[in-house]
């Protein structure tokens, strides 16, 4: 029995429904009385969700999955994940089981999105050129872990003397934190790119010092 | 069952280079930040350096292998690396490869058994 | 860095008896953190994580508790392979990724 999944990872926005497609050819004649239908975490064998016996057996996994009845009997086996997690993220095994029996595993992706960074100065005035200044840009609650690049108003990418940590809270959501030490000069522009690498977006920031006074745009 | 194999351990002087390696199986390798965790003769543990998830290759290092060492992995192979530089007498260790429990709770949930790294002159 | 101290250096006891291990963190890591038990010349072997959460396979007379700065591993009953040395980790605020300086508890 053939079993078909996508092969591309199924990318799903925290607290977002997601659905892991999974499908099967019936034969003539097929009736659902024959379908043993299970779900499972493919590394834990954690049972997701099943269907046995005819009749949907329900959630095993926190009441957040449902089945697509209706379509079952034209071979759509997938899986409707509800209101999304970061603990959720993983591959998950479809298992079909008719006469002949075939299984197939899809990953779920989680992603979450970076906040604008907030830009912070230390220490944040009687600045002059030949000063060193700790910039720190910080980005929340996204996934997975950011990249953090930083570039000055020309667009050079500076490296040197940049420090990053990430922070997950209880979701597993993480708060990204980037440090730059930097001697200023007669004025400049830093800018920070805080980027998601799952989702492709970019969060910037930018804090621009003209001597007295400085700006955050 | 999840096991983990490191191996390219090996007495090596001040200043040379070695690359260890470490085998995954068991679980789905590609889905799982990675870490390096040594462990001096007679001392503590300390993380060295981590890999993310996927293909995305962000990499964190202690301040103290900064600069000197590569973490690295191989997908396809279900296999992670740390290449190790102008190693130092304090680099001598048990070099352990380490599976974050998930990508967000750095907890290590499996461990491998360790390869000996000594540097000596 | 958070730095995390275990206390105390040096458990003796005897089996049967209760054991009490601390972990104190020089900032908060909310619920963040892990204990792991390594015997001589094995790896180490994760015992607790999320503060509280025994890992797979590992019997109930493990627990742990503690929130913020403070946590405990506690071995309710001594058995004879629970004699080894017990490391806390940190896993809120990182890198780097912390452990304490370890626990020894030895058979009196």
């Known amino acids: 029995l053939e079993v078909q999944v996508p092969e591309d990872p199924v990318v799903a926005l925290v607290g977002t429904d997601a659905t892991l497609c999974c499908s099967f050819s019936p034969e003539p004649g097929f009736s659902l009385a024959q379908l043993n239908l299970i779900w499972q975490l493919t590394d834990t064998k954690q049972l997701v969700h099943s269907f046995a016996e005819g009749q949907d057996q329900g959630s095993a996994y926190a009441n957040r999955t449902a089945l697509f009845p209706d379509l079952l009997a034209q071979g759509n086996a997938s899986l409707r994940l509800q209101r999304v997690r970061v603990a959720d993220e993983g591959s998950f095994t479809c298992f079909v089981s008719i006469r002949d029996f075939g299984s197939a595993a899809v990953s779920l992706q989680v992603a979450a999105p970076y906040s604008k960074p907030s830009m912070t100065l230390e220490p944040n005035k009687d600045l002059r050129p030949g000063d060193t200044v700790t910039i720190t840009c910080s980005s929340y609650r996204g996934y997975p872990e950011a990249e953090v690049f930083w570039q000055d108003g020309q667009g050079v990418p500076l490296t040197g003397n940049v420090t990053t940590s990430q922070m997950a809270n209880e979701q597993g959501l993480f708060d990204v934190h980037s440090v730059l030490r930097v001697v200023l000069g007669a004025n400049g522009t830093y800018s920070c790119l805080v980027r998601n690498p799952v989702l492709q977006q970019d969060a910037h920031g930018s804090v621009t010092i003209t001597g007295q006074p400085m700006t955050f745009p | 069952d999840v096991q983990l194999v490191e191996s390219g351990g090996g007495v090596v002087r001040p200043g040379e280079s070695l690359r260890l390696s470490c085998a995954a199986s068991?679980?789905?390798?590609?889905?799982?930040?990675m870490n390096w965790v040594r462990q001096a003769p007679g001392e503590g543990l300390e993380w060295v350096s981590r890999?993310?998830?996927?293909?995305?290759?962000?990499?964190y290092y202690a301040d103290s292998v900064k600069g000197r060492f590569t973490i690295s992995r191989d997908n396809s192979k279900n296999t992670l690396y740390l290449q190790m530089n102008s190693l130092r007498a304090e680099d001598t260790a048990v070099y352990y490869c380490?599976?974050?429990?998930?990508?967000?709770?750095?907890?290590?949930?499996?461990w491998g058994l360790g390869t000996l790294v000594t540097v000596s002159s | 860095e958070i730095v995390l101290t275990q206390s105390p250096g040096n458990l003796s006891l005897s089996p049967g008896e209760r054991a009490t291990l601390s972990c104190r963190a020089s900032q908060s890591v909310g619920s963040q953190l892990g204990w792991y038990q390594q015997k001589p010349g094995q790896a180490p072997r994760l015992l607790i994580y999320?503060?509280?959460t025994r890992a797979t396979g590992i019997p109930d007379r493990f627990s742990g508790s503690g929130s913020g700065t403070e946590f405990a591993l506690t071995i309710s009953s001594l058995q004879s392979e629970d004699f080894a040395v017990y490391y806390c980790q940190q896993y809120y605020d990182w890198p780097p990724l912390t452990f304490g300086g370890g626990t020894k508890v030895e058979i009196k």
């Open positions: 999320g503060a509280s």
């Open positions: 068991g679980f789905t390798f590609s889905n799982y930040a």
């Open positions: 380490a599976k974050s429990g998930s990508n967000s709770n750095n907890f290590f949930d499996y």
């Open positions: 890999i993310n998830y996927k293909g995305y290759n962000i990499t």
